[in-house]
């Protein structure tokens, strides 16, 4: 906490500029008008204020806006955003995607901090759902964002937003999350033709039920082993040898290398040896 002291003569800041980096903390407190700071926040980001000086500027804004900052200030916080606590951010009402982008840019290249997580939560709750533009923005900054959400939170993702999802955005999703996302993806891509549909749906198939896998096996999709290994075990078990052969196409030979791993191991144990032998891979049930 900086003591309240009078501003020395001639030191009152007429504007926010680089000369303020030469001010001591108490001079910043005494000589910078909080309302001026709020209107010229966009300049702060370009000025190499120290960590300690930014503390003083934050303190001034906190005093000016005890109920939370207006969006006009939030959008231009820049590096001052890194000073905010989740408690500070919970007071904000962020509605503009531009504001969200500006603050995510500040944290770019770093892991998602508690501040960023709180900001995103506030933003999404304010919008009521995770729309396509928001999802586009969030996954661009944090490819793992979607998989950080609970199945309950994912249920608010409208099918139309699924178009924004890239395969790498699903890399860390677990089966429970894919169970929620798969039906949305199926709905989103339902009007696409066979091969195009498979390209889009492929990364969501970890949530697919048996009947959908059976349907895919009739479409010459040539699923790769990496995708097959991510399928739900309970969805794979009822598939016949012929269906798996059709599903994998030329990739069926890869089953041998994966015979000790789920779901391949469990599927092999469910098959008749005669049927497995038709594959000519030496798989032992």
């Amino acid at each position: 906490e900086v003591e309240k002291t009078a501003c020395p003569s001639g030191k009152k800041a007429p504007e926010i500029d680089e000369s303020l980096i030469f001010y001591k903390k108490w001079e910043l407190e005494a000589c910078v008008d909080a309302a001026l700071l709020a209107t010229q926040m966009d300049r702060v980001n370009a000025i190499p204020f120290t960590y300690e000086q930014l503390d003083v500027l934050k303190h001034k804004l906190d005093e000016l806006y005890p109920q939370g900052y207006p969006e006009s200030v939030i959008q231009h916080l820049g590096y001052l955003f890194l000073k905010m606590s989740p408690e500070d951010i919970r007071k904000w009402n962020v509605t503009s995607l531009e504001t969200l982008k500006a603050l995510l840019e500040v944290n770019k290249g770093h892991e998602m901090s508690p501040q960023v997580a709180t900001l995103i939560d506030r933003f999404v709750k304010g919008r009521g759902q995770l729309d396509k533009d928001t999802l586009d923005t969030l996954t661009a900054f944090y490819p793992g964002y979607l998989c950080s959400l609970s199945p309950e939170e994912l249920s608010s993702v409208p099918p139309s937003s699924i178009w924004a999802v890239r395969p790498q955005d699903l890399d860390t999703c677990d089966p429970r999350q894919l169970d929620v996302l798969y039906p949305k993806a199926r709905l989103a891509f339902q009007n696409m033709n066979g091969s195009e549909y498979f390209v889009k749906i492929q990364s969501f198939l970890g949530g697919a039920p048996t009947e959908d896998l059976k349907a895919l096996s009739q479409q010459n999709v040539s699923m790769d082993l990496a995708t097959f290994m991510k399928l739900r075990t309970d969805a794979v078990l009822p598939l016949t040898v012929a269906e798996v052969q059709k599903l994998l196409g030329p990739h069926v030979e890869g089953l041998k290398a994966e015979e000790r791993h789920r779901p391949v191991r469990d599927w092999i144990l469910r098959q008749r040896q005669d049927d497995l032998d038709t594959l000519g891979l030496g798989l032992q049930g």
């Epitope: 680089e18 980001n45 370009a46 000025i47 190499p48 204020f49 120290t50 960590y51 930014l54 820049g78 590096y79 001052l80 890194l82």
Partner: nanobody
Framework: QVQLVESGGGLVQPGGSLRLSCAAS????????VAWYRQAPGKEREAVAV???????KYADSVKGRFTISRYNAKNIAYLQMNSLKPEDTAVYYC??????????WGQGTQVTVSS
């Protein structure tokens, strides 16, 4: 993570000169202001000079007329030419940008000692 490396410090007599250099590992200087700071033992870090991305310069009152800050964007280097050095200029000198200073990320600095 951007690395800033300061060099050029040393022991110099009062009235002498030194030229400090600050090299950045990334192309961070081109779009950002760069500042030189110093920290004397037992004192808080203070800014001594700043150069904006457009090349405008500003100085702390205590070094005006004696220190000159400059930059060479193509090489990601900033300089601090220090003339007419005084014993009270003795400190560790650091350079930084807005991002680095904001997150309290600093280089190792370079020691300047002014003594007879």
């Amino acid at each position: 993570q951007v690395q800033l490396v300061e060099s050029g410090g040393g022991l110099v007599q009062p009235g002498g000169s030194l030229r400090l250099s600050c090299a950045a590992s990334g192309s961070i200087f081109s779009g950002n202001a760069v500042a030189w700071y110093r920290q004397a033992p037992g004192k808080e870090r203070e800014a001594v000079a700043v150069i904006t991305r457009d090349g405008d310069t500003k100085y702390a009152d205590s070094v005006k007329g004696r220190f000159t800050i400059s930059r060479y964007n193509a090489k990601n280097i900033a300089y601090l030419q220090m003339n007419s050095l005084k014993p009270e200029d003795t400190a560790v000198y650091y350079c930084n940008t807005a991002r680095g200073a904001a997150v309290d990320s600093w280089g190792q600095g370079t020691q300047v000692t002014v003594s007879s």
